[in-house]
Interface confidence: medium
């Protein structure tokens, strides 16, 4: 089995308030089995942004069809960005279990929010 890598190619993304932000994340292996989750921030204070297995997350949509078994693209789009959305977003693979356990994280993408153009 190929070792799982989680690739967040963008170190930073800048978006105007009110626009949508696309945060890219791809994985290189389907193993181990388990969901992908997105968080803003690291450590105990991090905030769940998207969980493949639960929801809804009204402002978050996946860029590709994540329900397809062979899907390796877990990029997300967050709509109607506000300054409160600024931060570092991590795409994290969990290993299936009871409960699911964190397996590997991407390096993170920093989202900055520009003022809405007048």
């Amino acid at each position: 089995e190929e070792e799982l890598q989680i690739i967040q190619p963008d170190k930073s993304v800048s978006v105007a308030a009110g626009e949508s932000a696309i945060l890219h994340c791809t994985i290189t292996s389907l193993f181990p089995v388990g969901p992908i989750q997105w968080f803003r921030g690291a450590g105990p204070a991090r905030v769940l942004i998207y969980n493949q297995r639960q929801g809804p997350f009204p402002r978050v949509t996946t860029v590709s069809e994540t329900t397809k078994r062979e899907n390796m693209d877990f990029s997300i789009s967050i709509s109607n960005i506000t300054p409160a959305d600024a931060g570092t977003y991590y795409c994290i693979k969990f290993r299936k279990g009871s409960p699911d356990t964190e397996f590997k994280s991407g390096a993170g993408t920093e989202l900055s929010v520009r003022a809405k153009p007048s």
Partner: antibody, heavy 119, light 108 residues
């Protein structure tokens, strides 16, 4: 070859200002995030500030926030650090460091510029 | 912020010896860890990134390992030019980017 050359260091009194420059060559400057890292005499390395390639994303260490300003001029391939309200504890060698294109480690460093704050 | 603790603070060794330096993180940084070498009057030099990948031009006597919170840098056979200070740096939890306090490898 990648080259980073710092300049502008010197001796100042507490409360005074100084501006450091870092001239970059050997790579597409505007495509890379840049950082300042410092080292006080006899101490370890301390990250000071980073600026994204476009200049839109900027971060500072808490110890310098509100006093230091990082900026860049991509047309001149130059990184700057404006240091105001200097304190004795800011005395250090200040290094300009280029980030890798994918991750936040530093693949190239300058030789550093010595800043001494003393009354 | 993630705190990195390096040990020991100083190592006194002879050329040809094998040595292992340790870096511990206060929370998991996965494999987002780099090692640097610093000598007086020289620019710090990247040795290892991704916990175990050697940077361009780094001799294979340098190797890194570890993940999560525990990392090591091993120098298999010390050469005279390896006597220096070594720092680890995490780039998972950022900013701030944080460095360990350093380990000085000095000649016996």
């Amino acid at each position: 070859d990648v080259q980073l050359v710092e300049s502008g260091g010197g001796v100042v009194r507490p409360g005074e200002s100084l501006r450091l420059s870092c001239a970059a060559s050997g790579f597409t400057f505007s495509s890379y995030d840049m950082n300042w890292v410092r080292q006080a005499p006899g101490e370890g390395l301390e990250w000071v500030s980073l600026i994204s390639g476009s200049g839109e994303i900027i971060y500072y260490a808490d110890s310098v926030k509100g006093r230091f300003t990082i900026s860049r001029d991509n047309s001149k391939n130059t990184l700057y650090l404006q240091m105001n309200s200097l304190r004795a504890e800011d005395t250090a060698v200040y290094y300009c460091a280029k980030e890798d294109n994918r991750y936040r480690f530093f693949d190239y460093w300058g030789l550093g510029a010595l800043v001494t704050v003393s009354s | 912020e993630t705190v990195l603790t390096q040990s020991p603070g100083t190592l006194t060794l002879s050329p040809g010896e094998r040595t292992t330096l340790t870096c511990r993180a206060s929370q998991s940084v996965y494999t987002y860890l780099a090692w640097y070498q610093e000598k007086p009057g020289q620019a710090p030099r990247l040795l290892i990134y991704g916990a175990s990948s050697r940077a361009t031009g780094i001799p294979d006597r340098f190797s890194g390992s570890g993940s999560g919170t525990e990392f090591t840098l091993t120098i298999s056979s010390l050469q005279s030019e390896d006597f220096a200070v070594y720092y680890c740096q995490q780039y998972y939890d950022r900013p701030p980017l944080t460095f360990g306090g350093g380990t000085k490898v000095e000649i016996k």
